[in-house]
């Protein structure tokens, strides 16, 4: 009982060291504004959580859209 | 929130002009800056913007002498401009370029401007 | 290159009147355009983006229209207030541009 306390606890202290959980820690969304469609072509590059770099954050919005899918943005620049 | 240019000021032909750009209440990784001039008496003219992710882009009149970099621990972007002549005279301004990706993109937020004249 | 093209240069109505300034791209900007004031010795106030959406604060008597190629402002019961320079500026693209803004159009109050 008392090892598993100490294991418990630790995994506890581990989990709260690590930071935010979930999705936060993922990516952020990709801002997406439904009454006002279309992207424009300046490349500003995000990288994706799939791995991808999309060349601008609505790129990656509409392509959410269109593969119904939910990929984060995990870092601003190209992955 | 807000933008201001550094000071300005009296530059010879030739000189390097380099105005500083900083930024209050608003983090450099998640917006675009833009730098805008406007000679005495004439209309606005774009010089570059720097976006979210770093990349400058330039006019291209501006390409060959212009330099647009940004450190965003200190929240400033910086414009440095060669090989400046008597046409490079102008009020310069920083403003913050919101969503660059989107068709929404529009500079919301402007500094008051500063002066650069170049003479010998 | 995505050059921008304002009409007219100047333009003076009778206060309550309607001003109507006219902004032509070279190429397809879809709706990525930006309408500003200007007043002399003041940084240029952001009015409409989007080609048609109101920024903050700015009264509902200017109005955008446009897409594509054409777009228009619109400043109905004018006021000595709107006595200003007047400028377009696309946000579509930064590649290859001479200039993102319009030459400006100098709207005058009678």
């Known amino acids: 009982m008392k090892v598993t306390g100490i294991f418990l606890l630790s995994a506890l202290a581990l989990l709260s060291l690590s930071g935010n959980t979930g999705a936060d820690s993922l990516g952020r969304e990709a801002k997406c504004y439904n009454e006002l469609n279309g992207c424009t072509k300046i490349y500003d590059p995000v990288c994706g959580t799939d791995g991808n770099t999309y060349p601008n954050e609505c790129v990656l919005c509409f392509e959410n859209r269109k593969r119904q899918t939910s990929i984060l943005i995990q870092k601003s620049g190209p992955c | 929130q807000s933008v201001k240019e550094s000071e300005g000021g009296l530059f010879k032909p030739t000189d390097t002009l380099t105005l500083t750009c900083t930024v209050s209440?608003?983090?450099?990784?998640?917006?675009?800056i833009g730098w805008v001039r406007q000679a005495p008496g004439n209309g606005l003219e774009w010089i570059g913007t720097i976006v979210t992710s770093g990349i400058p882009y330039y006019a291209n009149w501006a390409k060959s002498r212009s330099t647009i970099t940004r450190n965003t621990n200190l929240n400033t972007v910086t414009l440095k401009m060669t090989s400046l002549t008597a046409a490079d005279t102008a009020t310069y301004f920083c403003?913050?370029?919101?969503?660059?990706?989107?068709?929404?993109?529009?500079?919301?937020?402007w500094g008051q401007g500063t002066l650069v004249t170049v003479s010998s | 290159a995505y050059d921008m093209t304002q009409t007219p240069a100047s333009v003076s109505e009778p206060v309550r009147g309607t001003v109507t300034i006219k902004c032509q791209a070279s190429q397809s900007i879809s709706t990525a355009l930006a309408w500003y004031q200007q007043k002399p010795g003041q940084p240029p106030k952001l009015l409409i983006y989007?080609?048609?959406y109101l920024a903050s604060g700015v009264p509902s008597r200017f109005s955008g229209s446009g897409s594509g190629t054409e777009f228009t402002l619109t400043i109905s019961d004018l006021e000595c207030a709107d006595a200003a320079t007047y400028y377009c500026?696309?946000?579509?693209?930064?590649?290859?541009?001479?200039?993102?803004f319009g030459g400006g159009t100098e709207g005058g109050v009678k």
């Open positions: 500026h696309q946000g579509y693209s930064a590649s290859n541009v001479d200039n993102t």
């Open positions: 989007a080609a048609s």
């Open positions: 209440g608003f983090s450099l990784s998640s917006y675009a």
């Open positions: 403003a913050r370029n919101l969503d660059p990706a989107y068709s929404t993109t529009r500079l919301d937020l």
